[in-house]
């Protein structure tokens, strides 16, 4: 495995007071392997609400690299290939669980964390507010 | 805490051979709170590729209940509110980390697992295969 410079303040795994702590096996089982999902790899270009993917890296987090979607346009692409501003491209957001090293630099002490990521974009009809 | 009928084969937290195992604090930290509060969207109804949410439950997993997106139509909704089959509604999929009790019924031994979930749908131009 990876050797991490150890923080001298790392909690002791045997410490019965280590808060709300459980053992987690990081030998990640991938439930997706047999399902053969249709990969959504080129949807970001083919969508009427296309998006770009931006890399977000944090070495103290697992997974360290998360790709975030950013919609390319405010509007959506119409049949002529032009941006139609009567519709809106919006990000579909999702919370994901990640593990954060805590305290930092401790090789085998983590905290569960929820972060919000944008997964892709969809085209929606706008909400029009009528001013009285 | 919770009292769980204990599996006699539960691993010993102090066992140095427990594979690739780390201590995880389950006091879930919410990174979103100060920066980006989550907004429960109605995009699943307003999208040109609308979707329904379907319940998937597995009591040995956290989160035990996952609501998955299923696109309502093969095509996309056009400006007249009709389904246009010249375009395709497709699911945007994302891998998420979940925790699985392993061995089952062990109160504080878990395994990380990756599962693929459909988060929402987007409208894409179809790939047309021309037969020679």
């Amino acid at each position: 495995g990876i050797t991490i410079p150890r923080n001298p303040g790392c909690p002791n795994s045997e410490d019965k007071n280590f808060p709300r702590t459980v053992m987690v096996n990081l030998n990640i089982h991938n439930r997706n392997t047999n399902t053969n999902p249709k990969r959504s790899s080129d949807y970001y270009n083919r969508s009427t609400s296309p998006w770009n993917l931006h890399r977000n890296e944090d070495p103290e987090r697992y997974p360290s690299v998360i790709w975030e979607a950013k919609c390319r346009h405010l509007g959506c692409i119409n049949a002529d290939g032009n941006v139609d501003y009567h519709m809106n491209s919006v990000p579909i957001q999702q919370e994901i669980l990640v593990l954060r090293r805590e305290p930092p630099h401790c090789p085998n002490s983590f905290r569960l964390e929820k972060i919000l990521v944008s997964v892709g974009c969809t085209c929606v009809t706008p909400i029009v507010h009528h001013v009285a | 805490g919770i009292t769980i009928p204990r599996n006699p084969g539960c691993p010993n937290s102090e066992d140095k051979n427990f594979p690739r195992t780390v201590m995880v604090n389950l006091n879930i930290h919410n990174r979103n709170t100060n920066t980006n509060p989550k907004r429960s969207s109605d995009y699943y109804n307003r999208s040109t590729s609308p979707w329904n949410l379907h319940r998937n439950e597995d009591p040995e997993r956290y989160p035990s209940v996952i609501w998955e997106a299923k696109c309502r139509h093969l095509g996309c909704i056009n400006a007249d509110g009709n389904v246009d089959y010249h375009m395709n509604s497709v699911p945007i999929q994302q891998e998420i980390l979940v925790l699985r009790r392993e061995p089952p019924h062990c109160p504080n031994s878990f395994r990380l697992e990756k599962i693929l979930v459909s988060v929402g749908c987007t409208c894409v131009t179809p790939i047309v295969h021309h037969v020679a």
Partner: antibody, heavy 126, light 107 residues
Framework: EVQLVQSGAEVKKPGESVKVSCKAS????????IGWVRQAPGQGLEWMGG????????DYAQKFQGRVTITADESTTTAYMELSGLTSDDTAVYYC???????????????????WGQGTTVTVSS | EIVLTQSPDFQSVTPKEKVTITCRAS??????LHWYQQKPDQSPKLLIK???HSGSGVPSRFSGSGSGTDFTLTINSLEAEDAATYYC?????????FGQGTKVDIK
């Protein structure tokens, strides 16, 4: 259909403790959490704390920290709330409520209470 | 602690009338705002979760809207059985907090 059935009314003296039970049926007990909310006579709702059954992790409101203990027993699908050092201010109806703990519409949905117990009246009087 | 302030505290309404109750949060809570109905001597019942999504078996006359700090519960055509106290509740941050309640009675 989820149902939460609470233990009966209690009369206690100041300084004593009370333990209220909440028996859950319907759905998988492990899949959700249980929150505890109280309501003093003629007053509003006040959150005391809760437990995530999957992990056995509790959260407490600071006001009750050190005085309240929330536990759950998966074998009997029952959650418990014990409040110690009772005073007349603790006279209230105590409710347990189901916290779905679902991954819903892209989010980890917690602390939105979708089913409630019938309430347990606790009277503290000397 | 996030403070939720409901208005009005009390509303007396005739049947078939439209009722609007507002809930203001002391900070941005996204959409993590829920509404409950409590009838006298009964437990609270979930009406609306996450600002605008109906709880199971809730009549369509109940709807919710809002995001951020300002939220609204609307009862479109009040029925006699809707006489109750309505509470908003935020799940954005611990401690979970509730509004002080709005009592709705029938004229």
């Amino acid at each position: 259909e989820v149902q939460l059935v609470q233990s009966g009314a209690e009369v206690k003296k100041p300084g004593e403790s009370v333990k209220v039970s909440c028996k859950a049926s319907g759905g998988s007990f492990r899949s959700y959490g249980i929150g505890w909310v109280r309501q003093a006579p003629g007053q509003g709702l006040e959150w005391m704390g809760g437990i995530t059954n999957f992990f056995g992790v509790e959260d407490y409101a600071q006001k009750f920290q050190g005085r309240v203990t929330i536990t759950a027993d998966e074998s009997t699908t029952t959650a418990y709330m014990e409040l110690s050092g009772l005073t007349s201010d603790d006279t209230a109806v105590y409710y347990c409520a189901r916290d779905p703990n679902e991954f819903w519409n892209g989010y980890y949905a917690t602390h939105d209470f979708d089913y409630w117990g019938q309430g347990t009246t606790v009277t503290v009087s000397s | 602690e996030i403070v939720l302030t409901q208005s009005p505290d009390f509303q007396s309404v005739t049947p078939k009338e439209k009722v609007t109750i507002t809930c203001r949060a002391s900070q941005d809570i996204g959409s993590e705002l829920h509404w409950y109905q409590q009838k006298p001597d009964q437990s609270p019942k979930l009406l609306i979760k996450y600002a605008s999504h109906s709880g199971s078996g809730v009549p369509s006359r109940f709807s919710g809207s809002g995001s951020g700090t300002d939220f609204t519960l609307t009862i479109n055509s009040l029925e006699a059985e809707d006489a109750a106290t309505y509470y908003c509740h935020q799940s954005y941050n611990l401690p979970i907090t509730f509004g002080q309640g709005t009592k709705v009675d029938i004229k």
